[in-house]
Amino acid sequence: KKEDGESTAPTPRPKILRCKCHHHCPEDSVNNICSTDGYCFTMIEEDDSGMPVVTSGCLGLEGSDFQCRDTPIPHQRRSIECCTERNECNKDLHPTLPPLKNRDFVDGPIHHK
């Protein structure tokens, strides 16, 4: 829909979802809670020194199916899980780093918990 004045409301509207955010809080978040029309996520990845880093937050509906698809990237270990079933559902997501031998795979499953 257009956002500049001539459109009417879509039906049905998406309902806003609240998610926990950590290391990935947008500017409008309050008390480490963000809002989205899409998914909550939790992601684990290795930083440059090989230490695991967990981030969590909100993914917008647009493009979130792709972002929630756990597609291994060569030379980068990371895993992401997404959820929508209740507010702050990503508190209960605990993705684990894939084993080293999986790093050259090209595709992976969509992780919706």
């Epitope: 956002e3 049905p12 309902k15 947008p26 500017e27 409008d28 809002s35 917008g60 209740r86 507010n87």
Partner: antibody, heavy 117, light 113 residues
Framework: QVQLQQPGAELVMPGASVKLSCKAS????????MHWVKQRPGQGLEWIGD????????NYNHKFKGKATLTVDKSSSTAYMQLSSLTSEDSAVYYC??????????WGQGTTLTVSS | DIVMTQSPSSLAMSVGQKVTMSCKSS????????????LAWYQQKPGQSPKLLVY???TRESGVPDRFIGSGSGTDFTLTISSVQAEDLADYFC?????????FGGGTKLEIK
Amino acid sequence: QVQLQQPGAELVMPGASVKLSCKASGYTLTNYWMHWVKQRPGQGLEWIGDIDPSDTYTNYNHKFKGKATLTVDKSSSTAYMQLSSLTSEDSAVYYCARSGWDYFDSWGQGTTLTVSS
Amino acid sequence: DIVMTQSPSSLAMSVGQKVTMSCKSSQSLLKSSNQKNYLAWYQQKPGQSPKLLVYFASTRESGVPDRFIGSGSGTDFTLTISSVQAEDLADYFCQQYYRIPWTFGGGTKLEIK
């Protein structure tokens, strides 16, 4: 059509508590947030808080924490707001309103709360 | 909290005239992730509950006459009534839904001469 039905008026003694109701019809209760808004005579609007009926998750305006408690009864499609330790400052019209996003696309007619002895 | 300031507090116009009212926020309501302004306008006629006119600053709610036009971005917003009608006698409120707690402006009272 969407309807949010509220009692017209409540008269309560100072120091007491009151539980205001908002009965939703014409839509699926769990598909929208339910908000409560305060309006004192001749004044503006104040957001009190909201509840997601699907999981009873709540957000409160910090100004109303400890004053207001939001609940929902899915079986009767009714949202409630309990106000405690009432004073004359709580005398106002209280509206329930629903949202998908956080703007309010349907409002109840409001309950006029009078706190007086 | 985000402070919303409306001006003028009241105005009196004749039927057919163009009306503009202002709403300013204490911080930007433009969300960078989707380039939407998280601002709504409501009309409250005497003795009635508020009614949604415009959301995302410029998207008219279904069923709202096209003489109501929302505009602006960031911190400065305007509601224009292109040709005011007698039934537009009401208070008009803006509301930000960018960051909790959601806050309203003090309102603009429109009187008809």
